[in-house]
Interface confidence: low
């Protein structure tokens, strides 16, 4: 009974299409598949950034796979052929592994790359990224930002740089159509007359870096002798009400009484008759139903009530 063997895939390679981290892994069928014409061959692909403890594993019938990687580090991948048990009248047969690696040869020392890169998607509308020049780079060094997300034909360069002393230190992005809920890739590279400059790569999803506007129209309403309802409105913009969490800070007679996080635009507060002054501020953040992360807005303007019967008046700022 001859042992059934199968070759690994041929021409396994990682191809960089210039999308700043979104790479293609591709291969060709193994040699000598003639014996298994009736069989659908599968491939088990494993890949990771070098230094990562875990491999991502994919089983596919295709001859290619695409995913995003961190180009600040190298990439390693391996693949083997799988013959399902149906093809072999027994157990699954696996080939040996074909392996490949990919990395962008780094230029310059790490200290030349941009420092403290910070990107914020203001009110889910305007993306702004800022950075500091690398430690010790000379004043002739300039940085350029490129970005790509699925839907763009090719990587685009920033066209509206923020400058300080003639040096690019940030980018204001144009309107980014259909750019959320997918990986957004950025490369900041640099040029200098006398030094190689290290490139930096960043990947994030825009909905996770949203900083909303603060809530507006804060009001008090007396609900009963010992309850006051605080209300506010969501800010103008594209973020729907269901996407907000709020943090309230309430001060009573110069003492912080309550800090609370709530999911809707009201909060009921128990009070005493001795309360002379009540103030509150609110800030907003995109919640877990709409993103995995977010940035708190600035605090709203403060709304205060001083010594006046709240049952007689609703305060609007």
């Amino acid at each position: 009974d001859t042992e059934i063997k199968v070759n690994p895939p041929q021409d396994f390679e990682i191809v960089d299409p210039g999308y700043l981290g979104y790479l293609y892994l591709q291969w060709q069928p193994p040699l000598s598949l003639d014996h298994f014409k009736e069989c659908t061959v599968e491939y088990e692909l494993k890949y990771r950034n070098i230094g990562s403890e875990t491999w991502k594993t994919i089983i596919t019938k295709n001859l290619h796979y695409k995913d995003g990687f961190d180009l600040n580090k190298g990439i390693e991948a391996k693949i083997h052929t799988l013959l399902p048990w149906q093809c072999t009248n027994g157990s699954e047969v696996q080939s040996s592994w074909a392996e490949t690696t990919y990395w962008i040869s780094p230029q310059g020392i790490p200290e030349t790359k941009v420092q403290d890169m910070d990107c914020v998607y203001y009110n889910w509308q305007y993306l702004l990224c800022s950075w500091k020049p690398g430690i010790g780079v000379l004043l002739d060094t300039n940085y350029n930002l490129f970005y790509w997300y699925e839907g763009l034909d090719h990587a685009l360069q920033c066209v509206d740089y923020i400058k300080a002393d003639g040096q690019n230190i940030g980018c204001r992005f144009p309107y980014l159509e259909a750019s959320d809920y997918k990986d957004f890739y950025i490369c900041v590279n640099g040029s200098s007359e006398n030094k190689p400059i290290r490139s930096s790569y960043f990947t994030f999803q825009l909905q996770n870096i949203v900083k909303p506007l603060p809530p507006v129209y804060l009001t008090f309403t007396r609900e009963s002798s010992c309850e006051i309802k605080l209300k506010w409105s969501i800010p103008l913009g594209p973020i729907p009400a269901r996407c907000f969490d709020y943090e309230i800070e309430i001060r009573e007679d110069d003492t912080t009484l309550v800090t609370a996080t709530v999911e809707n635009e009201t909060y009921t507060l128990k009070t005493t008759n001795e309360t002379r002054q009540l103030c509150f501020v609110v800030r907003s953040k995109v919640n877990i139903y709409c993103s995995d992360d977010g940035i708190w807005s600035e605090w709203s303007d403060k709304q205060c009530w001083e010594g006046e019967d709240l049952s007689k008046k609703t305060l609007l700022r």
Epitope: I109, D116, K132, I135, G136, L138, D165, N194, K195
Partner: antibody, heavy 119, light 111 residues
């Protein structure tokens, strides 16, 4: 590990020249600047200048500009400083010090070369 | 040239004490949000050793008891708890502008 090994002590006559060397190892020589610093006996530190080992660009302290010449030999990862028209106040220890310029600081120093100017 | 004035010029302290050395620059050494100020330690017969760069970033392998702070023109090196090996001379140095300049030094002596 990073090492900067400087040439040995020199005794020279006033008006003469001296050429000091600093051999680098343990890092990519051309990715860094080489600085030269003077320290007179019992005194503070004085920056002479620096040379970019990648492009050969130099920045000098004006006080030394006409008398100090900084060069590098990339093939041997060696930096040189030539001091001309020596006078007694040039008697000092001279250090080479690696740094990625500006805010990165001078993070590795040679052991120093004592130059004595005496007739 | 940017002039750096260190104070005190000498300091007597005991093991376990907290020591603070200040450095004042004749003009700001900040640029691009970075303070171009470095601190060195030097022992007799030895080259200087980088302790702090960019005002507050620690040199590689330096003990955590050394810390730097400040911006603009006023900077401080703090040694939180003096050890016997810390008795040495300390120099500040600016690298914002050529020529780079050093402070006059602070000699830290054992009391």
């Amino acid at each position: 590990q990073v090492q900067l090994v400087q040439s040995g002590a020199e005794v020279v006559k006033p008006g003469a020249s001296v050429k000091l060397s600093c051999k680098a190892s343990g890092y990519t020589f051309t990715n860094y600047w080489m600085n030269w610093v003077k320290q007179r006996p019992g005194q503070g530190l004085e920056w002479i200048g620096r040379i970019d080992a990648y492009a050969g660009e130099t920045h000098y302290n004006q006080k030394f500009k006409d008398r100090a010449i900084l060069t590098v030999d990339k093939s041997t990862s060696t930096a040189y400083m030539e001091l001309r028209s020596l006078r007694s106040e040039d008697t000092a220890v001279y250090y080479c010090a690696r740094g990625y310029g500006d805010a990165y600081g001078m993070d590795h120093w040679g052991q120093g070369t004592l130059v004595t100017v005496s007739s | 040239d940017i002039v750096l004035t260190q104070s005190p010029s000498s300091l007597s302290a005991s093991v376990g004490d907290r020591a603070t050395i200040t450095c004042r620059a004749s003009e700001s050494v900040d640029n691009y949000g970075i303070s171009f100020m470095n601190w060195f330690q030097q022992k007799p017969g030895k080259p200087p050793k980088l302790l702090i760069y960019a005002a507050s970033r620690q040199g590689s392998g330096d003990p955590a008891r050394f810390s730097g702070s400040g911006s603009g023109t006023d900077f401080t090196l703090t040694i939180s708890s003096l050890q016997p090996e810390d008795f040495a001379t300390y120099f500040c140095q600016q690298s914002k502008e050529v020529p780079w300049t050093f402070g006059g030094g602070t000699k830290l002596e054992i009391k």
